[in-house]
């Protein structure tokens, strides 16, 4: 999906109002220094591409993120503010969701969510630069 036509201001507002709180709740009990940020993004569409990938694409050691509240909210936000996102992405993420087993917050998942927080912060910084 090409995130170029999204309403970035509205996505930022949703992130600051609600998604960020759920990400921080998920990370509770860990320190910001516990993980190094290894994933980066260069502009707003690129940041959303990386956020979409890390949130919804299962990895061998962390397959359960798409069921989390922050993931459901991310999906709703992208569906609302990125025209055409639902048609191309929702069915794919729905299929992934069905393939998942039990919900276990592993260290690897915490690391992945730490990366997500970094990507979202980067997304907001690139937004501020443009304004």
């Amino acid at each position: 999906y090409d995130f170029t036509n999204c309403d970035f201001q509205k996505i930022e507002a949703d992130y600051l109002r609600t998604i960020s709180k759920d990400l921080i709740t998920y990370m509770s009990g860990t320190k910001s220094t516990d993980f190094n940020n290894t994933v980066s993004c260069s502009n707003r569409p690129h940041c959303l591409t990386e956020i979409q990938s890390l949130t919804f694409n299962p990895t061998p050691r962390c397959a359960s993120l798409a069921k989390e509240m922050f993931a459901r909210k991310t999906k709703a936000t992208l569906a609302l503010w990125c025209p055409g996102y639902s048609e191309t992405q929702i069915n794919a993420t729905q299929a992934m969701k069905k393939a998942r087993k039990s919900k276990v917050t592993t260290n690897k998942c915490l690391e992945q969510v730490s990366q997500l927080l970094g990507l979202w912060r980067r997304f907001i910084r690139t937004l501020l630069k443009k304004q």
């Epitope: 309403d7 509205k10 609600t18 998604i19 709703a76 936000t77 569906a79 609302l80 929702i90």
Partner: antibody, heavy 120, light 111 residues
Framework: QVQLVQSGAEVKKPGSSVKVSCKAS????????INWVRQAPGQGLEWMGV????????IYAEKFQGRVTITADTSTSTAYMELSSLRSEDTAVYYC?????????????WGQGTLVTVSS | QSALTQPPSASGSPGQSVTISCSGS?????????VSWYQQHPGKAPKLMIY???KRPSGVPDRFSGSKSGNTASLTVSGLQAEDEADYYC???????????FGGGTKLTVL
């Protein structure tokens, strides 16, 4: 049973406000969009706005901006539409309608409608 | 005044086909494949008949079909039946600001 049940008919004076409720049952309320659509007597459908409780987003039609407030109480699976500064042309049947989960732009479930009459 | 334009009326005899048009712009119908059609009988709530231009919800007869060309969407009812007599409204997604637009409605009469 999957349904939307709306509050009863209202008669209001010009200049006052009306608050219509829409109680959802049989589905996960928060993930869907709850839209409000009105229909004046003998007229067509007019979209007023939507709320997506999951992310707390509301979008209003430009015509109603500043006069309509849509809210939701996820604990009771109820959405509300409040319209202020009522005038006679606001006399209409007000419907709530469910916008599909993540596909918010089509309405697959409708409430029975609430008749609001504005008259002095 | 509606942002989407529909003919006020259409008619056909039982068994015939009738097509109702819905005209918009590149900002709504032409820009997205997000057109819906609703049927409304007098005194009843509307019912979704077609969504995403041409998809039918379960329970809607396959006599109802939708299509789109450029900025115009169409609803075709084939093999008309008496119970198809109703008002039909088109609707389109219109971007993240306007969100939803409705047509003015078409009264379908089965002769």
């Amino acid at each position: 049973q999957v349904q939307l049940v709306q509050s009863g008919a209202e008669v209001k004076k010009p200049g006052s406000s009306v608050k219509v409720s829409c109680k959802a049952s049989g589905f996960t309320f928060g993930s869907y969009g709850i839209n409000w659509v009105r229909q004046a007597p003998g007229q067509g459908l007019e979209w007023m706005g939507v709320i997506v409780p999951l992310v707390g987003v509301t979008i209003y039609a430009e015509k109603f901006q500043g006069r309509v407030t849509i809210t939701a109480d996820t604990s009771t699976s109820t959405a509300y539409m409040e319209l202020s500064s009522l005038r006679s042309e606001d006399t209409a049947v007000y419907y709530c309608a469910r916008g599909q989960e993540y596909f918010y732009w089509y309405f697959d479930l409708w409430g029975q409608g609430t008749l609001v009459t504005v008259s002095s | 005044q509606s942002a989407l334009t529909q003919p006020p009326s259409a008619s056909g005899s039982p068994g015939q086909s009738v097509t109702i048009s819905c005209s918009g712009s590149s900002s709504d119908i032409g820009g997205y494949n997000r057109v819906s059609w609703y049927q409304q009988h007098p005194g009843k709530a509307p019912k979704l008949m077609i969504y995403d231009v041409s998809k039918r919800p379960s329970g809607v007869p396959d006599r109802f079909s939708g299509s789109k060309s450029g900025n115009t969407a169409s609803l075709t009812v084939s093999g008309l039946q008496a119970e198809d007599e109703a008002d039909y409204y088109c609707s389109s997604y219109a971007g993240t600001d306007t969100f939803i637009l409705f047509g003015g409605g078409t009264k379908l009469t089965v002769l």
